[in-house]
Interface confidence: low
């Protein structure tokens, strides 16, 4: 069916980067400036995405592909195709509705985005804490407590709180 239709449809011959111009007896016209067609046989070209404001251009628009945006420094991409930009926080923090907040004791975040995660509970694996955790780093688990001198202990952090409706924290 596709093959039959394509033989009858002059627009099917129009390659990517062009459109089938009904105003010009269905000839293949190049996409106008700031527009593109990523597939052949299209009757219109799509308007190029413009990376404005907090968005910046990662890849320029061409006649066959849309522009791609990322975020200006201090922000990171969210959503499909970087449809939104969200504020960065520092390591050891997470973004809340009130801005960047330090991770609670027993949790850490080693990135500029995302949420604070609980420290690993070494004792669950029969190990002990070799290096204590910080706001920025998880604990490092070492040998089992039996292999260590008396007094070694594992850290069991409190469960992280949540901000309801938005994000597990």
């Amino acid at each position: 069916f596709e093959r039959t239709r394509s033989l009858q449809d002059p627009c099917s011959n129009c390659p990517a980067g062009t459109f089938c111009d009904n105003n010009r007896n269905q000839i293949c016209s190049p996409c106008p400036p700031n527009s593109f067609s990523s597939a052949g046989g299209q009757r219109t070209c799509d308007i190029c995405r413009q990376c404005k404001g907090v968005f910046r251009t990662r890849k320029e628009c061409s006649s066959t592909s849309n522009a791609e945006c990322d975020c200006t420094p201090g922000f990171h991409c969210l959503g499909a195709g970087c449809s939104m930009c969200e504020q960065d926080c520092k390591q050891g923090q997470e973004l809340t509705k009130k801005g960047c907040k330090d991770c609670c004791f027993g949790t850490f975040n080693d990135q500029k985005r995302g949420i604070c995660r609980p420290w690993t509970n070494c004792s669950l694996d029969g190990k002990s804490v070799l290096v204590n955790g910080t706001k920025e780093r998880d604990v490092v688990c070492g040998p089992s407590p039996a292999d260590l001198s008396p007094g070694a202990s594992s850290v069991t952090p409190p469960a992280p709180a949540r901000e309801p409706g938005h994000s597990p924290q």
Partner: antibody, heavy 121, light 107 residues
Framework: QVQLVQSGAEVKKPGSSVKLSCKAS????????INWVRQAPGQGLEWMGN????????NYNQKFKDRVTLTVDKSTSTAYMELSSLRSEDTAVYYC??????????????WGQGTLVTVSS | DIQMTQSPSSLSASLGERVTITCKAS??????LSWFQQKPGKAPKTLIY???RLVDGVPSRFSGSGSGQDYTLTISSLQPEDIATYYC?????????FGGGTKLEIK
Amino acid sequence: QVQLVQSGAEVKKPGSSVKLSCKASGYTFSSYWINWVRQAPGQGLEWMGNIYPSDSYTNYNQKFKDRVTLTVDKSTSTAYMELSSLRSEDTAVYYCTRTWEFYYDSVFDYWGQGTLVTVSS
Amino acid sequence: DIQMTQSPSSLSASLGERVTITCKASQDINSYLSWFQQKPGKAPKTLIYRANRLVDGVPSRFSGSGSGQDYTLTISSLQPEDIATYYCLQYDELPPTFGGGTKLEIK
């Protein structure tokens, strides 16, 4: 590409229950909240609740808390909304929509096509 | 629950005209407000989030403003494709609550 595909229309009797599904594809299911929003014919939008698939944490609108149950099946990337004790005023289109895990500015960036539930005796 | 009072409930405007829709919250919502556009038989589409941030791909003729309890959606020059119903949504507190909607028609 990202898609939320909802189950088909339902006709139910007052007092019965209905369970709607929302199958997600094209993204990491566990990294987004699934919200349920309904719209009665010719009326506005009403948020019913949401669920975080990673650990099934839920928030409910108190208006529906006793009648709505949100669940997920991570193996099939499907979210479910069950509404019990149906009454005629529950006749509405029910939408599922997602919000990003870390995103405090709740942008519902993708929506299902909606499921019409008709409650009639 | 936070109540969102949206006005007007319907609005008739000419093409090219500047259109303004307002939403008033029953308490301060700290700019946690989105605006949606919904066309008949379709799911809503987010236009604005955090009161004034335009979702990428939404035409720049749409803008949002406001703070505290009072918020505004403005269409600087009405186009045929803007004919739809518009809703505001507060998400400062659970449950998120929508305004009653504004049906926009061509004069």
